[in-house]
């Protein structure tokens, strides 16, 4: 059953035994209570009782799944890829029907020679993985094929793959212009018809760490953001320390709420701390401010 419980927190105890005071604000939090048999577990926010403890859904944790994590695991792919659909016309081979059959001796031989030729053409492109013939048709031999590119994931992967696709275009244009038949014969490994070279389509892996971060943060999506460290993206809330966006709570504890990150200020034996960043200290005996 879905219930709305008014939460009014006035103080928390820190690990040193001091009190953390918070304004008494009524935050109406939707709470899902999971009941298993006679066990009413109070697993909130979609969490479920596994018989021993609450199993929380991202981005929640805690005994009752009532707290919000400071960072969410996002896993970019190890590598990202691009696929270019190209067509070239090979003039140094006469088309025969056997070339349509991918298990024929003719197709296998053509595939081997074409792959060898393309490996030479694209040898200077570090992202180049290989080619895959999708169709052969009459005219001398029209070769519909995919050029496969791959690179390690970095924040700039799209630029790297875009650059690689441009180099592929340049190189295939160059070879199909230079390796042409002379006196009805070819002196290269393969010869081409210059006008038969076309780039039909380019598909690049779509991975957006910001999108993944926002999706996993759910209703806290506006408060989680992506920061990079060693080219790796981290999905963090301002309560996660050590990042540019980290909130400095000084004499307090950072806590996420549905209104964003806020500081819960501590009260020590000698001071009350207040202010948005808990940086205003008031001495209990003298009542004057330290900034």
């Amino acid at each position: 059953p879905l219930a709305t419980i008014p939460v009014s927190t006035t103080s928390l105890t820190s690990s040193e035994g001091s009190t953390i005071s918070t304004p008494s604000v009524d935050i109406s939090t939707p709470v899902t209570t999971s009941i298993v048999g006679d066990q009413c577990s109070r697993c909130k926010n979609g969490g479920f009782w596994d018989g021993l403890k609450c199993q929380c859904l991202t981005p929640y944790y805690g005994e009752s799944c009532e707290e919000v994590v400071n960072s969410i695991d996002i896993a970019p792919p190890e590598t990202v890829s691009a696929q270019m659909e190209l067509t070239v016309t090979v003039t140094s081979v006469k088309f025969t029907d056997e070339l349509k059959n991918h298990s024929s001796q003719e197709f296998r031989e053509f595939n081997k020679t074409f792959t060898e030729q393309m490996n030479i053409v694209y040898s200077g492109i570090p992202e180049y993985v290989g080619v895959n013939i999708t169709n052969l048709r009459l005219g001398s031999v029209v070769v519909e094929h995919d050029v496969l590119l791959r690179t390690k994931y970095t924040p700039e992967y799209k630029t790297a793959l875009d650059n690689a696709t441009e180099v592929v275009k340049q190189k295939i244009t160059k070879v199909t212009t230079e390796q042409i038949m002379t006196n009805d014969n070819c002196s290269a490994l393969m010869c081409f018809n210059t006008t038969g070279t076309q780039v039909q389509n380019i598909t690049v892996t779509q991975y957006d760490p910001v999108e993944e971060c926002r999706q996993k943060a759910e209703e806290y999506e506006d408060y989680f953001l992506v920061e990079y460290r060693d080219q790796k993206p981290y999905c963090i809330s301002p309560c996660e320390s050590g990042f540019n966006a980290s909130k400095n709570c000084n004499h307090g504890k950072c806590q996420m709420s549905q209104n964003g990150a806020r500081c819960l200020c501590v009260t020590t034996e000698t001071h009350w701390y207040s202010g948005e960043d808990c940086n205003q200290g008031t001495q209990k005996s003298h009542h004057h401010h330290h900034h």
């Epitope: 081979v93 025969t96 056997e98 001796q105 070819c186 490994l189």
Partner: nanobody, 124 residues
């Protein structure tokens, strides 16, 4: 796989004749390309002639035109090179090459199947 075995090489005087043979096996079709290449010591392998076994195409290098004749016997799956008016510069190792494709290339790298070669020496 395709197997090629050459024969017919030997020593011959300038102006003489020789007939080379190349027996092919392992083809799944009766329409393919066969060629003769040669390689003299210290030189690159070069095309002599090629033929499509369906009779659609023959090619001769300029240096052998009018003196050499390439032919193919479909019933025997055998390639021949009739060499007449032999010259000292024809001395080389002669190789039979084949492709399951109908090739129009004189680049040896485009030809996947090769025989072991037969030596032709033209000397007085």
């Amino acid at each position: 796989d395709v197997q090629l075995v050459e024969s017919g090489g030997g020593v011959v005087q300038p102006g003489g004749s020789l007939r080379l043979s190349c027996a092919a096996s392992g083809y799944t079709s009766n329409r393919y390309s066969m060629a003769w290449f040669r390689q003299a010591p210290g030189k690159e392998r070069e095309v002599v002639a090629f033929i499509w076994t369906d009779g659609g195409r023959t090619y001769y290098a300029d240096s052998v035109k009018g003196r050499f004749t390439i032919s193919h016997d479909n019933s025997k799956n055998t390639l021949y090179l009739q060499m007449n008016s032999l010259r000292a510069e024809d001395t080389a190792m002669y190789y039979c090459a084949a492709s399951s494709l109908l090739l129009q290339t004189i680049n040896p790298r485009a030809w996947p199947y090769w025989g072991q070669g037969t030596q032709v020496t033209v000397s007085s």
